[in-house]
């Protein structure tokens, strides 16, 4: 299994939208993609699941496109706010 | 709304060559992967494969890989089947479907059918 | 690859009939799509993740089951609900979808 973030930095604007990209390798059948944003204390919050085979998941301002034939999950953040500033990460499970 | 307008019906010579197409429309194309899947009176609906119009990463079923090469032109919002080495048994109708995330396909193309005949 | 096996594979009925066909999977899967197709036609979703309804189908239809075996229920058939009727499942890698139920007015 491998889970691999090309975007090492990305800058955006308040009130706007920024989607980061998460692309992964996995030999199981079913799995969930999680997103998790990294505060500056360390500690990992979650903020969205993704299923293997469910619809595109959402959950208020963040929201995933999933792309399960290319293994491609990417998170989508609206309406950007100053504390959304921080480190994101993406991870495979089962 | 959304719409995935095929190419026409298609007569052709075995051991020729065939691109079918399938533009879409009423989305961003990019923001979705494209699906084909072949239908015939014997084996019923089999997936294809699919590509991912934003990367050009695809992904084939098995049974197909060498038969069928997908692409995607991001400017037209157009995406592409080839379909090499053509028998008889080829012969079927050809759909483009798009997905909703990892369940199920929401919308169809119309279908073309292709006939493999000398 | 995961197979789907449907059955029966024609259904006859007479209006008003409470019919049901059955998709049964070769491993077990979280979730079965149906689709219903009419002659010259493309596939049209019509039950999505096992039970959920897809837009403007009526309500006469509904759909149930777990694991491996998976159903289509239409309360009361009427003459526009002629069709075949397909499974699909996009639990493995590759996504499969049965033969088909063929369904027929009597």
């Known amino acids: 299994q491998k889970v691999t973030q090309a975007q090492s930095s990305v800058s955006m604007p308040v009130r706007k939208a920024v989607t980061l990209n998460c692309l992964y390798e996995t030999s199981w059948w079913s799995y969930y993609i999680f997103w998790y944003k990294q505060l500056p204390s360390k500690e990992m919050i979650f903020l969205i699941r993704q299923g293997s085979d469910e619809q595109n998941a959402k959950s208020g301002r963040y929201s995933v496109n999933f792309k399960k034939a290319a293994k491609s999950v990417a998170l989508t953040i609206s309406a950007l706010q100053l504390e959304d500033s921080a480190k994101y990460f993406c991870a495979l499970g089962e | 709304q959304v719409q995935l307008q095929q190419s026409g019906a298609d007569l052709v010579r075995p051991g020729a060559s065939v691109t079918l197409s399938c533009k879409a429309s009423?989305?961003?194309?990019?923001?979705?992967?494209m699906h084909w899947v072949k239908q015939t009176p014997v084996h019923g609906l089999e997936w294809i494969g699919a590509?991912?119009?934003?990367?050009?990463?695809?992904a084939y079923n098995q049974n197909f890989k060498g038969k069928a090469t997908l692409t995607a032109d991001k400017s037209s919002s157009t995406a592409y089947m080839e379909l090499s080495s053509l028998t008889s048994e080829d012969s079927a109708v050809y759909y483009c479907t798009r997905p909703r995330g990892g369940s199920h396909f929401d919308h169809w193309g119309q279908g073309t059918p292709l006939t493999v005949s000398s | 690859q995961i197979v789907l096996s449907q059955s029966p594979a024609i259904l006859s009925a007479s209006p008003g009939e409470k019919v049901t066909m059955t998709c049964r999977a070769s491993s077990s899967v979280r979730y079965i799509h149906w689709y219903q197709q009419k002659p010259g036609s493309s596939p049209k979703p019509w039950i999505y993740?096992?039970?959920n309804l897809a837009s403007g189908v009526p309500a006469r239809f509904s759909g149930s089951g777990s694991g491996t075996s998976y159903s289509l229920t239409i309360s009361r058939v009427e003459a526009e609900d002629a069709a075949t009727y397909h499974c699909?499942?996009?639990?493995?890698?590759?996504?499969?979808f049965g033969a088909g139920t063929k369904l027929e007015l009597k």
């Open positions: 590509i991912d119009p934003e990367t050009g990463i695809t």
């Open positions: 699909q499942q996009w639990y493995s890698d590759t996504p499969t």
């Open positions: 993740a096992t039970s």
């Open positions: 009423g989305y961003t194309f990019t923001d979705y992967e």
